[in-house]
């Protein structure tokens, strides 16, 4: 099953795919494309690498902004709307019949948080909460944590996108977030 | 207009060889996948092979591996497929298709038959 | 190899009705489906992929649904040119597979 990673609307997403150049600097293609992996290529390409960079993108949305020529190709999605929810392909285009690997990862785009109790402060989830969740029998991945993050007790509800904010502890340091007083 | 037009079916016999042609126009041929496509009479259409443009990976059922051939001449935007060490199983209509996973649009096809 | 079942093998409607076409994947494909038509003696012709999306071309009366392992092709108001043979087939799996068709015929 694939991974889920949620975003909050007007804010950006980030969906996680790598792998490692070998040898270091052996750049393969890549291609990002919205719908699960079909058997060949991409389907609805969004993004598209060749061995050097970044060739053929769909819209200015759309950025790898990682350690591209170290094999960090994380597709990011800039301001985000309901529309952009849905498995995502990453397919790393290995040289050889049937080599490619491919990854799906679904994105969950949620409206703005609504926060209790009252005064709150109104957040976004791109890159302010560890963004995974998983789906499946495998048990939960490795969470991303960019940054350091606020100690948040959540609860995501798969049929209600609202966010429930309980307690919040730290200050949002390097994260991300925007704060907004209600 | 797109338009795939196929050639080189007929009657052969078993153990024989046949190489079809499909002759593709109104598009830039170079940056397409192709593939072809059969269906035996009454049965369900059965994906053969493809070929990824530009890159030259190609791709088979595995009832046509090491038999069939799939190759293009881009000079020509033409799609062929060499059959060799042919079956009476082959024997279907074979279109050529562009696209890679969904194929629109499609020639017209043309039959082999593959009998004694 | 994942086997496409389309149901039913013959549908006998008549013009102006709404016509319901069923799909079935013996394994999860997502939304890697694609609906053809084919007429007699006639290449098939793309009518929707990636389950949802109509191709270039194709009248609003068809339409697409479904994920997973059950999609439909519903054709809201049959027209006389509409009679013909349906396939449906995954290109989420290697091979790539075709369901065996459903007739649509003039009762």
């Known amino acids: 099953s694939e991974v889920e990673y949620i975003a909050e609307v007007g804010q950006n997403a980030y969906l996680p795919c790598s792998y490692t150049p070998a040898p270091p600097g052996n750049l393969v293609p890549v291609c990002w494309g919205k719908g699960a992996c079909p058997v060949f290529d991409c389907s609805n390409v969004v993004l598209r690498t060749d061995n050097r960079d970044v060739n053929d993108r769909t819209s200015g949305r759309y950025w790898l902004k990682g350690d591209f020529h170290k094999g960090d190709v994380s597709l990011t999605i800039e301001n985000v709307t309901l529309a952009d929810s849905g498995v995502y392909c990453c397919r790393i285009q290995i040289p050889g019949i049937m080599n490619d690997e491919k990854h799906n990862v679904k994105l969950v785009v949620i409206k703005p948080a609504k926060v209790t109790p009252a005064p709150t402060l109104q957040r976004d989830l791109t890159s302010a909460f560890p963004r995974m969740l998983t789906t499946g029998e495998h048990g939960p991945a490795e969470t991303q944590t960019p940054g350091s993050l606020p100690d948040v007790n959540l609860t995501v509800s798969n049929f209600f996108c609202e966010l429930q904010i309980f307690t919040l502890t730290n200050e949002l340091r390097d994260s991300g977030a925007t704060i907004r007083t209600a | 207009e797109v338009q795939l037009v196929e050639s080189g079916g007929g009657l052969v016999q078993p153990g024989g060889s046949l190489r079809l042609s499909c002759a593709a126009s109104?598009?830039?041929?170079?940056?397409?996948?192709m593939t072809w496509v059969r269906q035996a009479p009454g049965k369900r259409l059965e994906w053969v092979a493809n070929?990824?443009?530009?890159?030259?990976?190609?791709y088979y059922v595995d009832s046509v591996k090491g038999r069939f051939t799939i190759s293009t001449d881009n000079a020509k935007n033409s799609l062929y497929l060499q059959m060799n060490s042919l079956r009476a199983e082959d024997t279907a209509v074979y279109y050529c298709?562009?696209?890679?996973?969904?194929?629109?649009?499609w020639g017209q096809g043309t039959l082999v038959t593959v009998s004694s | 190899e994942i086997v496409m079942t389309q149901s039913p093998a013959t549908l006998s409607m008549s013009p102006g009705e709404r016509a319901t076409l069923s799909c079935r994947a013996s394994?999860?494909?997502?939304?890697?489906l694609a609906w053809y038509q084919q007429k007699p003696g006639q290449a098939p012709r793309l009518l929707i992929y990636?389950?949802?999306t109509r191709a270039t071309g194709i009248p609003a009366r068809f339409s697409g649904s479904g994920s997973g392992t059950e999609f439909t092709l519903t054709i809201s108001s049959l027209q006389s040119e509409d009679f013909a043979l349906y396939y449906c087939?995954?290109?989420?799996?290697?091979?790539?597979?075709f369901g065996q068709g459903t007739r649509l015929e003039i009762k």
């Open positions: 298709a562009r696209g890679s996973n969904w194929f629109d649009p």
């Open positions: 109104g598009f830039t041929f170079s940056t397409y996948w």
């Open positions: 070929i990824k443009q530009g890159g030259g990976d190609k």
């Open positions: 394994q999860s494909v997502y939304d890697n």
């Open positions: 990636g389950a949802s």
């Open positions: 087939q995954q290109y989420t799996h290697w091979p790539i597979t």
